[in-house]
């Protein structure tokens, strides 16, 4: 699925829905992109409690385990994003996989991801002839990480 | 910076370089998007050795520390991506912050990120009038995570 770029318009870039295909179908095909988190969602039940599993996906085997929460917006590209939610305040012991170790904190790793929103074009709300894709940075939590607590100087 | 979508073209979507502005400036303004990794690059010297710091950014305080490596393609949106490179094979001890604990593995968390490539439109290489933005999934390592080794059933 691709955007086709053509010279001769007054804004960069200017894009057009297809005549041949139903725009909702086409828009969703283009916007859906990846609809899976880094680790398979089918396995995330492993990680719904504060323990480090010895099997399953990475988010459940981590000593800073997390689950994925879906963030869906049909007017965004990509339409589905996943936020990591830490299941423990502290890291789980490597020995037991269940007891928490107060020496380590389980914290989310945030990232400003590039996304695009479908919007009415500025000053053209009434025409319904055009829409704009607006680039934005959107904060997502990618994973949870076991860190040593910050020591202030 | 936004894409302007307009009805009436034969492909979805069809986009136009600006007449008013220098195309390289405009294209890169749109494609550059976020040019920073989740943690500030200026601090990543903290994490260039296999140890967990007590200060600095998250990637250097993690007991599975990592550094960020730039992946740049001017024909991609976003043009700059960052890959996490694990600095230790095992997790660093929470007690010492330096000795490795063989009970835990430091492993990269991979994610298929949505990106767009600027390409000649199919069958139009000779016209010099259009280019296409092609959606792809691109594998990046987001972070390194301390996990309990997988135990096979």
């Amino acid at each position: 699925v691709s955007l086709r770029i053509q010279e001769g318009c007054s804004h960069l870039p200017s894009c057009c829905p297809s005549k041949e295909q139903e725009p909702p179908e086409e828009w969703l095909k283009w916007s859906s992109a990846s609809v899976s988190p880094p680790e398979p969602l089918s396995h995330t039940h492993h990680a719904e409690s504060c323990r480090a599993s010895k099997d399953g996906p990475l988010n459940s085997r981590a000593i800073s385990p997390w689950s994925y929460e879906l963030d869906r917006d049909l007017n965004r590209v990509p339409q589905d994003l996943y936020h990591a939610r830490c299941l423990c305040p502290h890291c789980v012991s490597l020995q037991t996989g269940s007891h928490m170790d107060p020496l380590g904190n389980s914290v989310p790793l945030y990232h400003n991801q590039t996304v695009f929103y479908r919007r009415p074009c500025h000053g053209e709300e009434g025409t319904h002839r055009r829409y704009c894709l607006e680039r934005r940075l959107y904060r997502v939590s990618l994973a949870c990480v076991c860190v040593r607590p910050r020591v202030m100087a | 910076v936004s894409l302007r979508i307009q009805e009436g073209c034969s492909h979805l979507p069809s986009c136009c370089p600006s007449k008013e502005q220098e195309p390289p400036e405009e294209w890169l303004k749109w494609s550059s998007a976020s040019v920073s990794p989740p943690e500030p690059l200026s601090h990543t010297h903290h994490a260039e050795s296999c140890r967990a710091s007590k200060d600095g950014p998250l990637n250097s305080r993690a007991i599975s520390p990592w550094s960020y490596e730039l992946d740049r393609d001017l024909n991609r949106v976003p043009q700059d991506l960052y890959h996490a490179r694990c600095l230790c094979p095992h997790c660093v001890s929470l007690q010492t912050g330096s000795h490795m604990d063989p009970l835990g593995n430091s492993v990269p968390l991979y994610h298929n990120q949505t990106v767009f490539y600027r390409r000649p439109c199919h069958g139009e290489e000779g016209t010099h009038r259009r280019y296409c933005l092609e959606r792809r999934l691109y594998r990046v390592s987001l972070a390194c995570v301390c996990v309990r080794p997988r135990v096979m059933a």
Epitope: - | P24, E69, L70, R72, L74, R119, Y131
Partner: antibody, heavy 125, light 108 residues
């Protein structure tokens, strides 16, 4: 008209630091998408890419030589510099600087579209 | 890191003969670039993005390929085509420019 010209010491001894300068005109290295790289060629051998610097000061180095290379730029004087630490006889070569930054309708080309004439460097004790 | 292997390393061709120079990448790449270099001169860009001829390059030259296999073809060899040809690619991660070892083309 785009021109690039390399300059260097000509001859230096092993373990010394090689300093090269590329003076260019006809384009600005502050233009988005523009970059300038260094390539070397030992006599009778092939081309070897060494380093690259972009308009936004992002730098790339050949991984095997990264610890010895430093690339930098001075926009005001339209110059790019390359230093190679601890040179050896294997660093004897003709050193070229070359520009990258050609935008076509389909995107940027990663080819070096303009080259300097090269400067010969001999490392000898 | 991707390695480019050119073949043959040296070849000779008679005037009017068709010539094909190959460039093989160790893993799949999107595009290939080609340069021509004559003794005592700097390399000149010859083919952009696999198949686009640089300005001033005669139409008897063409480029093609995809994936790991690319080639430069001269439909009818001429004396002025005698030179060394290099293939080159850019890899975004880690960001590196890589050259093939070169093919020296001589006129018979």
């Amino acid at each position: 008209q785009v021109t690039l010209k390399e300059s260097g010491p000509g001859i230096l001894q092993p373990s010394q630091t090689l300093s090269l300068t590329c003076s260019f005109s006809g384009f600005s290295l502050s233009t988005s998408g523009m970059g300038l790289g260094w390539i070397r060629q030992p006599s009778g051998k092939g081309l070897e890419w060494l380093a690259h610097i972009w308009w936004d000061d992002v730098k790339h180095y050949k991984p095997a030589l990264k610890s010895r290379l430093t690339i930098s730029k001075d926009i005001s004087s339209s110059q790019v510099f390359l230093t190679i630490a601890s040179v050896d006889t294997a660093d004897t070569a003709t050193y070229y600087c070359a520009r990258m930054g050609q935008l076509h309708y389909y995107g940027y080309d990663y080819a070096m579209d303009y080259w300097g004439q090269g400067t010969s460097v001999t490392v000898s004790s | 890191q991707i390695v480019l292997t050119q073949s043959p390393a040296i070849m000779s061709a008679s005037p009017g003969e068709k010539v094909t120079i190959s460039c093989s990448a160790s893993s799949s790449v999107s595009y290939m670039y080609w340069y021509q270099q004559k003794p005592g001169s700097s390399p000149k860009p010859w083919i952009y993005r696999t198949s686009n001829l640089a300005s001033g390059v005669p139409a008897r030259f063409s480029g093609s390929g995809s994936g790991t296999s690319y080639s430069l073809t001269i439909s009818s060899m001429e004396a002025e085509d005698a030179a060394t040809y290099y293939c080159q690619l850019y890899h975004s991660y880690p960001p590196t420019w890589t050259f093939g070892g070169g093919t020296k083309l001589e006129i018979k």
